[in-house]
Every structure is written in C-alpha cells, then in structure tokens.
Interface confidence: medium
C-alpha cells in the first residue's frame, strides 16, 4: 500500500522536511503534489511525468520543493505555514489513479528564555514571589528548576498561567536559592539565566557568647552577640537597661561585683525594620558560690539515653570535683568528664545510674559541695513474671495469676487468654475453674514513658488427670567429684505430691541426695560415678498418679591409675613383648607410650616383636580424658636378658 | 461414645437464610467449646467461630462477622449455626466440632470430634 | 491473622516410601514451651480426622507411621511407611491466636 513517511515529523522552522514515498508502484506515468488532504488542482505544488522526466510547478509551488524521480518531495526553508497535509496523487500506466496523504508540523525554534520577577526584595514569612518564564510562546512548555533541580513538592510552590508563572507563598530563607526557566517544543528546549531570590529574613533571637554566666571578680567580661538576618543585623548592647554601645562585642575589663546584672544585646534588620532582643545575666563573684548540678535530661530512658550532668555555675581556672554514691568517680568507660571537669557525662544511663551525684567546686581553702541529684532512670518493663509458676490445675479450684514486671515508672497490666484481652489488672481471678478455662495466658506490661511493652505467655491446664511428668536436668553431663546436679520434676501442679525412684528403688539415704522445692527437685552433690543410674520421679494426687520416662545420669570419671599387663617385668631375649593398658574412665580415655621417656604409639596395646635386652628400659602409659580434663600415667620397668642366663624369666607373649 | 449429629442438606434461595444443627451425644455440651468449620467445593478449612454454651460467649472470625450466627441450647445439647442473605459463595460443607475427651494437653482449638457435616447449596 | 502456607499442594509417592508435608507459620505458634500446630488427615466425603497436635504429639488410635516436628514458624509431617489408605488431603491448623488451616496438601499413592 502506497505511503508518505515525514522526515522529520516536527520540523524546525527554517529546516527542511522529505516526505518519503514508500511502496510506489510500478509502471507509472507520473505524479503530483497537493497540499491537503485532497487532490485539488488549486493547490498542486509540483507535478512529474516519468516518460519526459518533466516537473510542472502548480498554483502552491513555492519555489522551495523538489521532486524526485522516486516521488518523493523536500521542501526547504520551511515555514509556519507549511505546517499540515500533503498529498501524492499517483497515476498509473494503466491511467488508474493511487492516492496517500502524510503530513508534518512546523515549530518555531524556542529564544533563549529570561525570568522576571515581581518582587526582588522579599521579606520572609510576609511576602510572595511570582518568577515569569519570558516570552510567552505558543505551543511551548515550561519547566523550572531550583538549585538544577525539578521543583519539591510543597503546599508554598505553586505553578500557574500553563506553569509559565512561578509562584513562592510566604517565602523562608531556605527559598534563597538558584531558580532557572526552560522553555521546550517538540523541536527546541532552552533554559534561562539562573536568577538568585535573595530573601530578607531577621534578625533572629540573637546568641550571646560565651554561655557561661558565672565570672570572678577581677576577670575581663567579653562577651559576643550574633543573630542570622539578612542583611546582616546591627548591635547594640544594653547593661540594666541602658544603653553602652552600637558594636557586636562587649568587652569590660577587669569586673567587680558591681558589674553584676542584665546584659541585653539587640539585633536590628534595617530591610524587614525588625528588632529582637536575648538577655543574659552574669553574675560576678567575689568567692566561689555554693555550685549546684544541672542535667541535660530529668528523665532518662534506659539504654538509649545519655544524661549530661554540669555543675554550675562556671567558673573560669576553677577545679570541678565529682562524686557519685558518696564515692568518687568509678572508672568506666560510661561515664566521660568533659576537659574541664565541669560536664559529667553517664553513656546509656542503666537502672543502676540512679545516683546520688555531687559536684564540688575546690578554691584556695576549701571544696564547696553542690546538693546531692538523683536521677529518675525510665526502664523496663523487663520480661514479667507470671505467678504462681504451676502450669496444672484440678477443676473447681480458684485460678489467681500476678503479674509482675520491673519498670519505672511501675508497669500497666493487661491479661489476654487465648490472644483475647481480658482486664487491666496486675491481678486475674477466675473462680471455679473448670477445663474449658485451659488455654495460653499472656501478661503484657507496658511502661507508659518509654512506651516499650514486654509479655510473657503462660500455658494453664485445667484438668482432673496429672500428666506424665518429665525430668530436667542443670547439668546433662557431670563431672565425679566436681559437679552437683539438679533434676526437677515438671510441670509445676498445684496440690501434687512429688516421689523420686532411683533405679526402680526408692532414694536412698545419703548426705549427697537433698530434696527441695516441695520434693520437686532432686540434687545429687559431688556426684560419683556409682551416681550413673536412672532417675524416675512421679506426681499424684487424689485422682491420679504418672511417672515419668527413667533419665539416666552420665557421669563423667576418670581416668583412673592405669594398669599394665600382663604383670611380668623379665623377658627372655627373642620373645615378642605384648604390653596392654587399662584405665577405668567415662568417656573411655585416650591412651599413649613412652619407652625411656620417648614419645611411642598412640594406641591401648603396645607391641614388640623379638626384643633383645636393647629394650630393657621405663615403659609409661599415659591415659587422658579429654571431658573431665584430667590425665594419669603409669611406669613398668622391662627386663630383657639373652636366652638361658637366668632360671625363672618369662618366656614372653 | 462421643458424636456430634448434624442436620441434613439444605437447597435454599440467594438472599435466604438457613438454620442448621449440631447436637452431641456421650457428652455435656456445656463444658466444652462449639466450633463452627467451612469447607467450600474442592476447598480448604476455614473456621468461623465458637460459643461457649454455658454463658453464650461466642467470637467469630473476622470474615464471618454479620455472616453467621452461633448460638446453643443445652437442654438439648444441641448447637446452631445460621447463615443469612446468602449468596452463591456460601455454598459449602459446615462442620461443628469440639475439643473432645481424648487428651488433657491443654488448648481449646485443636478438634478430635466432628460432625460428619451440613451440605448447603444456595441456588439463584 | 497468622497465614499458614503448606507445600506441597500435591505429592505422589510411592507405596512404603516417605512422604514429608511442609507448613510455614507468618510468625511463631510457639509460647510457654508449646508449639500450637495441629495436623489433620482428610478423605473424600468425610470430615476431617485430628492426627497430630501440639506438634508432635500423636493423637489416640492414630498408627504410629505418621509423625510430627517442628517449632516456631516452621513444622513437618512425616508418613512412614506410606500405605494405600493415607490417600487423602492433609491440613495444619494453628491456635496460637485465633485458629486458622493451611490450604491443604494432597497425597497420592502409586
């Protein structure tokens, strides 16, 4: 099918444009022009005829087209006007006409664009600013830029007039930035200059320094007022309410007592006509005053505050003391003293921080001691505590559970059952319980300063049966002598009876076997290897009685003195020496030889064979336990004489 | 023996309601929970509620709030669930349940005693 | 709400071969030294049948082939060996809070 392709689409003005002729039939007469969207001969630019390769210009010829033999057409210098629809009339050899339209729209090249403003000056948090991207063009597209960036979305933005116009409500300091215009259509973009906003803001509340407030007599008072405002404001200081001078600094050499008072500085914006005032009062001593503490934070949460203690007030070439419980300052890597001893400094302030701190203030004769702090360290909730801690109870009973939970200020209680809140109460009664009160139990405690909460989750069952029990233990694998061990019966029933059975007989009586926990708990001291048994405990009631599975205690032992055999110590010359060595131990020992103190194999058995009296010598064997840590050894002197010297030796192995 | 007996199938209305049956033998309906469980065609469980026939405390799932109604009457022993304005999605196999005898461990949501189940076909 | 997601949602295997089901809990079911995870055997036509609970712990009258583990978010149930009559959908249901049933594993046997 017979198509026009613009080349380009948007075309500059002043450029040129090729309307490309795809799928051209063949065997053609010849064609032509027209601009529109018909073929009107009114409006023929240009027509060919292929037989002569003749061109005709028509009625719209401008003298800026040229025809191609391919049909296509470049129209050059292109102006306004151009923009729309062109039309190629086709006409085949068989005189059958084709006919497609293209077209094309022409842009003007976008000038440089310049912003103008209506208010150079503007005051902050009175004035608005509206910034206007010039000149107004049609069909162009405006965009804006703050320091090079797209604008922030802010409710004080706000663009109008096709976005040409900018406008900044209520202008802040922060508005004091870089702004550009960019002009774009689909042929051209252009930015503008960047223009500065200088807003006027100030003075604010000017700053007076040093901070310190505290002088001696005899000292130099310098003091330096400072307040942001733009322009830069104007100073004036007043002492007591009259005025000394029009400079930012203060300075008054070597002050007595009688400089004591009110020190106003007074910043003043000559642009926004605006004045503020800070007050300061020094005070000037003759003798180091009684110091006092200040803190940065009254109530400081556990683990995420610092608190900053400083004794006031400051003095200069002065020695600042610290005390803390009465005692002076622990070494530790919390607590930090600023250089000159006047800021003590508690890292993440823990419960324990509480205090009291003193400071002290030490002159020629004397240390001076502030009143003693106590800080009120927020913490918690630890992890509550639910009791009592049974887990089984008979129906029909009374079901009272507390909750507690260390905290400051004290904790606010809440009880779920099955993830339904119930109350907020550090208490929960339910009387008469029957089965269908069984269920998870959950105390969450919540610390309302912090606003940090912790819960514990307890499982109750309401039942006339006793569970099969089981044993825990504190220690899976003791060592003989060394260790004791805890087992204890669990769950935790109410109104049970506890019993022990040590391998299937009742406990025995013995100064290293103690019950406690109401018979609960079972504790074997310095264990022996004999102790290696299986434990049973049972519960019962008036309704039922279980026992539990046996655990069998693993004792570690050993090892033991190591025993060599067979006995013999004399061989004859020629027999093959077959030494084994044994040691009682849990788990079983690590064995190893030395002959005359030479390291030898690593093995139970040691085997020569055909010895000669070149091994006469010490045979060792060291045993060692690798869980229990301990080593042991033993020595056997061998004899080896030559064949038939003496009556009575072994003929060997 | 311990049985939970279900009424028979229901063919209802869009937009109707249906009141179906759940009545225990072997056992007091009062101390246990009733639970109400959907089972859509070729779908798995959901559980919409309990009540606890004793006092008629009753909780129900999120989803089924407004949906069912749970309620019980314990000289029959016998526990209700009613679903109204019923739409093609209701359409399901409704099984009561309960915590039954056969453990002491602890914990009122674990079933080991169904009914055999309600068909409810909600037709337009 | 604690989403339960099971997996498979369907297994073949062969008869006295293993088969192992998966459920992942969106947070923990574990509290107070229990884990609340409870498995259910289900056979076309008929109601749900209670195998596991608490876990692990195998409920009366149920063969000792079938068994369960796990803690916290993430819990298992083993069949072996599997027989012809295991055939059937298989759910976990937790009761840490409000209950809530996995979308169901089916098992066939070749």
């Known amino acids: 099918k017979l198509t026009i392709e613009s080349t380009p689409f948007n075309v500059a003005e002043g450029k040129e444009v090729l309307l490309l002729v795809h799928n051209l039939p063949q065997h053609l007469f010849g064609y032509s022009w027209y601009k529109g969207e018909r073929v009107d001969g009114n409006r023929q630019i240009i027509g060919y005829v292929i037989g002569t390769q003749q061109a005709t210009p028509g009625p719209a010829y401008s003298g800026r087209e040229i025809i191609y033999p391919n049909a296509s057409l470049l129209i050059q210098n292109i102006i306004q006007n151009d923009t729309g629809f062109y039309t190629l009339h086709v006409i085949k050899s068989d005189l059958v006409n084709e006919e497609a339209t293209g077209q094309f729209r022409v842009y003007p090249e976008l000038p440089k664009p310049s912003i103008s403003s209506n208010n150079s000056k503007p005051v902050e948090d009175k004035d608005a600013v509206a910034f206007t991207c010039e000149p107004e063009t049609q069909d162009a597209t405006y965009l804006w830029w703050v320091n090079n960036q797209s604008l922030p979305v802010s409710p004080r933005l706000q663009l109008s007039n096709g976005n040409r116009t900018l406008t900044l409500f209520n202008v802040t300091r922060n508005d004091t930035a870089s702004y550009k215009c960019e002009t774009q259509n689909p042929v051209s973009a252009r930015r503008s200059d960047s223009v500065i906003l200088n807003v006027l803001y100030g003075p604010d509340a000017p700053t007076i320094s040093p901070l310190n407030t505290s002088y001696r007599s005899g000292e130099n008072l310098n003091l330096s007022c400072h307040a942001a405002s733009n322009p830069p404001a104007q100073y004036s200081w007043f002492v007591n309410g009259t005025f000394q001078q029009s400079t930012q600094e203060l300075f008054i050499p070597n002050i007595t007592v009688n400089n004591s008072g009110s020190y106003t500085c007074q910043a003043h914006n000559s642009d926004t006509g605006l004045n503020r005032t800070t007050v300061t009062t020094i005070t000037v001593y003759a003798e180091p005053p009684k110091p006092f503490i200040t803190s940065n934070n009254s109530n400081p949460v556990e683990d995420e505050d610092a608190v900053a203690l400083t004794c006031e007030p400051e003095i200069q070439n002065t020695t600042y003391l610290w005390w803390v419980n009465n005692q002076s300052l622990p070494v530790s890597p919390r607590l930090q003293l600023s250089n000159d001893n006047r800021t003590l400094t508690l890292l993440s302030v823990t419960r324990n921080d509480v205090g009291p701190y003193e400071c002290g203030i030490q002159n020629e004769l004397s240390v001076d001691h502030s009143d003693p702090v106590i800080l009120n360290v927020l913490y918690g909730p630890d992890d509550p505590t639910i009791s009592p801690s049974y887990t089984y109870y008979r129906p029909g009973v009374n079901l009272s559970l507390s909750c507690h939970a260390a905290s400051n200020p004290p904790a606010q209680y809440s009880w779920l059952i099955d993830g339904n809140i119930q109350q907020h109460t550090q208490e929960l009664f339910i009387s008469n319980i029957t089965e269908k009160n069984s269920g998870l139990y959950t105390c969450q405690a919540n610390n309302s300063a912090s606003g940090h909460s912790r819960t514990t989750v307890k499982t109750i069952t309401v039942s006339a049966e006793l569970p099969k029990p089981s044993i825990s233990s504190n220690n899976s694998k003791p060592v003989e002598d060394k260790d004791a061990v805890a087992f204890t019966c669990e769950p935790e029933a109410q109104n049970t009876t506890y019993l022990w059975w040590v391998n299937g007989q009742s406990l025995p009586v013995s100064p290293r076997l103690q019950l406690s926990n109401g018979n609960r708990t079972l504790t074997l001291f310095n264990v022996t290897r004999n102790d290696a048994r299986a434990y049973v405990c049972g519960i019962q009631n008036s309704v039922s009685a279980n026992r539990s599975d046996p655990v069998t205690l693993d004792v570690l032992y050993g090892p033991d003195t190591p025993i060599i055999s067979p006995p013999d110590s004399s061989y004859l010359s020629g027999a093959n020496l077959n030494l084994s060595c044994h040691s009682a131990s849990n788990p079983s020992p690590q064995y190893s030889w030395r002959i005359n103190g030479i390291p030898q194999q690593h093995t139970q058995v040691l085997f020569i064979a055909k010895i000669t009296p070149n091994n006469n010598g010490t045979y060792a064997c060291f045993v060692s336990n690798l869980a229990t840590g301990r080593n042991n050894s033993i020595v056997k002197s061998i004899t080896v004489s030559a064949s038939g010297t003496s009556p009575g030796l072994s003929a060997g192995a | 023996e311990v049985q939970l007996q279900q009424s028979g199938a229901e063919l209802v209305r869009s937009g109707a309601s249906v009141k179906m049956s759940c009545t225990a033998s072997?056992?007091?309906?009062?101390?246990?929970?009733m639970h109400w469980v959907k089972q859509r065609p070729e779908q798995g469980l959901e559980w919409i509620g309990w009540i606890d026939p004793e006092n008629g405390d009753t909780e129900y799932a999120p989803k089924f709030q407004g949906k069912a109604t749970m309620t019980t009457d314990t000289s029959s022993n016998t526990a209700y669930l009613q679903l109204s304005s019923l739409t093609s999605e209701d359409t399901a196999v409704y099984y009561c349940?309960?915590?039954?005898?056969?453990?002491?461990?602890?914990?009122?949501?674990?079933?080991?005693?169904w009914g055999a189940g309600t068909t409810v076909a909600v037709s337009s | 709400d604690i989403v339960l997601t099971q997996s498979p949602a369907s297994l073949t295997v062969s008869l006295g071969l293993r088969a192992t089901i998966s459920c992942r809990a969106s947070k923990s079911v574990s509290a107070s030294g229990y884990s609340y995870m409870h498995w259910y055997q289900q056979r076309p036509g008929q109601p749900p049948k209670l195998l596991i609970y608490l876990a692990s712990n195998l409920q009366s009258g149920v063969p000792a082939r079938f068994s369960g583990s796990g803690s916290g978010t993430d819990f298992t149930l083993n069949i072996h060996p599997v027989e012809e009559e295991d055939a059937a959908t298989y759910y976990c249901q937790h009761s840490r809070e409000l209950p809530t049933f996995g979308g169901g594993t089916k098992l066939e046997i070749k």
């Open positions: 072997g056992f007091n309906i009062k101390d246990y929970y």
């Open positions: 349940n309960t915590r039954g005898l056969s453990t002491m461990i602890t914990t009122r949501w674990f079933f080991d005693v």
